[in-house]
């Protein structure tokens, strides 16, 4: 369960892949599309509002009873829109929604390789946001593979602003 309904902190950042491609968001036919692309030098990176929430582990998972806590994150590139996992389609989509946000909008934050992050679906443990064919997709990660796969690694570049932006 998420501890409390308000985030413990928020930050504004641009999101890029392990290979330094930018994650961008474009409004097309009244819905948002998500792209993974090389940005032209003068093009500004898209910003994402990351809201961080604490969540208690189910004690059976963590082996440490009530002590175990996870850090969950929601990602919003523009007002009222959040990244969501579509587990049936193995896709990552932007949906307009109101709070309280659905579970599909929450991702467990992992630090994997040092100074890279990964986003694991709250609704589907072992499934991560990843890059596939220049798009974001849901990728199942085999824990025996040590979770090092570069296609699920992302870099966050903090932007010193505190208010939600509007596209």
């Amino acid at each position: 369960s998420i501890t409390g309904i308000s985030p413990i902190t928020e930050s504004l950042a641009s999101l890029s892949t392990y290979n330094d491609q930018s994650i961008t968001f474009a409004l097309e036919d009244e819905s948002y599309e998500i792209y993974v692309e090389d940005l032209k030098k003068d093009k500004k990176k898209d910003k994402v509002l990351l809201s961080y929430y604490e969540s208690q582990h189910p004690s059976s998972e963590s082996g440490d009873g009530v002590d175990g806590k996870m850090l969950m994150v929601t990602l919003s590139p523009t007002k009222d829109f959040w990244l969501q996992a579509n587990n049936k389609e193995h896709s990552v989509e932007l949906h307009k929604c109101e709070k309280p946000l659905p579970d599909q909008a929450f991702f467990v934050l992992h630090n994997r390789s040092f100074n890279c992050v990964s986003f694991e679906c709250k609704t589907d443990p072992g499934v991560f946001i990843g890059v596939k064919d220049n798009h974001l997709a849901l990728i199942k990660v085999d824990y025996s593979e040590n979770l090092g796969s570069e296609n699920i690694l992302f870099k966050l570049s903090e932007i010193l602003e505190h208010h939600h932006h509007h596209h």
């Epitope: 413990i8 902190t9 175990g68 992992h110 994997r112 040092f114 979770l147």
Partner: antibody
């Protein structure tokens, strides 16, 4: 109850080796980011080496790279720091610490051991 | 590496006083800052994480604030057991660097 107990410290000559252990109980070691931190005599805290829970990725501060190796034995729920080619400036109390959150170091380190003293001197 | 500049390096205060310790990061670290208390011969104790979240079991006289690059630890109504050395640590990116420490001593 979460507990971390370090051992393996002692007096060693420059160029020598030591292996520090950190026995963890009350939680699953592999689920958390673990970190070795040291405090030299009359000095502040310095992060030495870390290991990521889920990926097992490792980190070393520049001054120990190539000399120290962090590892863990999941079956024994124990963290290790193998210290080779020790120098006088490695003299310190070494603490092991566990992250607040199970998959990230963003929240800092909630549980610490009492520390083990490493003295490098001839 | 991110440099953490902590001030003052020491402060002499009386029981009941309010103490403010500041920490400045050399680059933006969002709210990823922790504060620790260290007493001789004891394990460091986490007081505040994520800049302002009070660690469970820590008295409410301890509070943290700030984001970006500037952060503050405040002890309101210092108690005898609060005389110790306090460290900030940026937990945003490796290496996870500490400030130089602030010694809070009895006046």
């Amino acid at each position: 109850e979460v507990q971390l107990v370090e051992s393996g410290g002692g007096l060693v000559q420059p160029g020598g080796s030591l292996r520090l252990s950190c026995a963890a109980s009350g939680f699953t070691l592999r689920s958390y980011v673990m970190y070795w931190v040291r405090q030299g005599p009359g000095k502040g805290l310095e992060g030495v080496s870390g290991i990521s829970g889920s990926s097992g990725g490792t980190y070393y501060t520049d001054s120990v790279k190539g000399r120290f190796t962090i590892s863990r034995d999941n079956s024994k729920n124990t963290l290790f720091l193998q210290m080779n080619s020790l120098r006088a400036e490695d003299t310190a109390v070494y603490f092991c610490a566990r992250s607040v959150y199970s998959t990230t170091w963003y929240g800092g380190f909630q549980h610490w051991g009492q520390g083990t003293l490493v003295t490098v001197s001839s | 590496d991110i440099q953490m500049t902590q001030s003052p390096s020491s402060v002499s205060v009386s029981v009941g006083d309010r103490v403010t310790i500041t920490c400045r990061a050399s680059q933006v670290i969002s709210s990823w800052l922790a504060w620790y208390q260290l007493k001789p011969g004891k394990a460091p104790k986490l007081l505040i994480y994520a800049a302002s979240s009070l660690q469970s079991g820590v008295p409410s006289r301890f509070s943290g604030s700030g984001s970006g690059t500037d952060f503050t630890l405040t002890i309101s109504g210092l108690q005898p057991e609060d005389f110790a050395v306090y460290y900030c640590q940026q937990t945003n990116s490796f290496p996870l660097t500490f400030g130089g420490g602030t010694k809070v001593e009895i006046k």
